[in-house]
Amino acid sequence: LRLLDFPAPVCAQEGLSCRVKNSTCLDDSWIHPRNLTPSSPKDLQIQLHFAHTQQGDLFPVAHIEWTLQTDASILYLEGAELSVLQLNTNERLCVRFEFLSKLRHHHRRWRFTFSHFVVDPDQEYEVTVHHLPKPIPDGDPNHQSKNFLVPDCEHARMKVTTPCMSSGSLWDPNITVETLEAHQLRVSFTLWNESTHYQILLTSFPHMENHSCFEHMHHIPAPRPEEFHQRSNVTLTLRNLKGCCRHQVQIQPFFSSCLNDCLRHSATVSCPEMPDTPEPIPDYMPLWEPRSGSSDYKDDDDKGSSHHHHHH
């Protein structure tokens, strides 16, 4: 979690002098409670916005907006603490709006916004706005919280952000998988404009089951510059295993910007349609049989072969 470095955040508005400060997430009013405290924020809304850094990079940000309740407690409102908690890491980042003048009226509803918390693709957050000073130990809470889900890099607007582009979001491999005779699959995909290697993981499953019955890894060496954006064709040889008919092909690139953590793309070939009256299968027959002398079905050299070429 971090704050956008540009432009400098502003909380001042007509009728209110205010400055934005970094916060330890532990306001002084927790330690030294006050007698009179303001009411809680109203209509807290969190939206996904996008902002450029000074370097021109585009990042997703949490746009936080809330209003004040129209009661007399604004006379005791000294500011607000904004907190963003990344749920999976338990990392928290806070800023404080420090009011440098008193709010005296409700001629119009007071509205506040902040759009400087940078968020990560495909992550979940809890956003809290605390009005300051915070309440006395048994006082009514004067904060409001909302959860916020950031879309992943498949999302159209997210795709062009710097963190997504760094993980390879602009690469569209347009994978096609074709079943050939003799237990083979032809996988075709578009190479990206970088001289980096790729890995194809073939995982096969029995019909209607989620436990794999065959896995095969295939390495594709880095293409030459003249092969960038060309189609690469790979033929994978399947093991002839009973009922092992649903195949998932996953392509993992190793771009320099994301290394082992690049976005992966996959395509699936379904099992062929079953005939209406299938031959009865004895109860005891396994869904697949390992080759004689082999006790498991994980990939090793004799169980799947492949070859590839780049098509210009």
């Epitope: 969190i46 749920l87 999976n88 890491t89 338990n90 979940e124 909302k146 959860n147 953590d261």
Partner: antibody, heavy 116, light 107 residues
Framework: QVQLVQSGAEVKKPGASVKVSCKAS????????ISWVRQAPGQGLEWMGW????????NYAQKLQGRVTMTTDTSTSTAYMELRSLRSDDTAVYYC?????????WGQGTLVTVSS | EIVMTQSPATLSVSPGERVTLSCRAS??????LAWFQQKPGQAPRPLIY???TRAAGIPARFSGSGSGTDFTLTISSLQSEDFAVYYC?????????FGGGTKVEIK
């Protein structure tokens, strides 16, 4: 491909404890939290809580507080949910699911039967 | 706690029909709402998140709409495999809560 595989069905006596496991594969385990949801026979879905696979941070449903403990073992990419002082109304299918807010992948479920 | 109410509890429809399921929150949940489909003996399957975004691999006949307190899941042309129970779930605030479900059955 993302998969969550849960441990098998359990039959327990009232007052006993049960520990259900959920083994994750096909993604970086520490990048997402694991949530637990249960479903009593013929009933709807009930959120039990979640655990961060990264930090171990937890958030439990109020009604289960004190009876439930969620843990993870990052070395085996496995999440665990332990429920103590079992009662007959804890009889349910217990599901693990990936993420903390929106559950995009689910385990197959573990039936826990509490009966004397 | 935010209470999610689904209606109707049961819906009897014929294949090919357009189906509209309703979910109402006891207070605003913005667009922080998901829909799940569950068939007997199976885990729930995610259909929609953020009120209107289809989950990966979900056919275009499923669509979600609404924000605030009122939400709708629409199946434009019901297929035989769509007969199931549908649940909505809010993730706007803790505790996360589900609706009671709507069972879509064959007429």
């Amino acid at each position: 491909q993302v998969q969550l595989v849960q441990s098998g069905a359990e039959v327990k006596k009232p007052g006993a404890s049960v520990k259900v496991s959920c083994k994750a594969s096909g993604y970086t385990f520490t990048r997402y939290g694991i949530s637990w949801v249960r479903q009593a026979p013929g009933q709807g879905l009930e959120w039990m809580g979640w655990i961060s696979a990264y930090s171990g941070n937890t958030n439990y449903a109020q009604k289960l507080q004190g009876r439930v403990t969620m843990t993870t073992d990052t070395s085996t990419s496995t999440a665990y949910m332990e429920l103590r002082s079992l009662r007959s109304d804890d009889t349910a299918v217990y599901y693990c699911a990936r993420r903390q807010l929106y559950f995009d992948y689910w385990g197959q479920g573990t039936l826990v039967t509490v009966s004397s | 706690e935010i209470v999610m109410t689904q209606s109707p509890a049961t819906l009897s429809v014929s294949p090919g029909e357009r189906v509209t399921l309703s979910c109402r929150a006891s207070q605003s949940v913005s667009s922080n709402l998901a829909w799940f489909q569950q068939k007997p003996g199976q885990a729930p399957r995610p259909l929609i998140y953020d009120a209107s975004t289809r989950a990966a691999g979900i056919p275009a006949r499923f669509s979600g709409s609404g924000s605030g307190t009122d939400f709708t899941l629409t199946i434009s042309s019901l297929q035989s495999e769509d007969f199931a129970v549908y649940y909505c779930q809010q993730y706007d605030n803790w505790p996360l809560t589900f609706g009671g479900g709507t069972k879509v059955e064959i007429k």
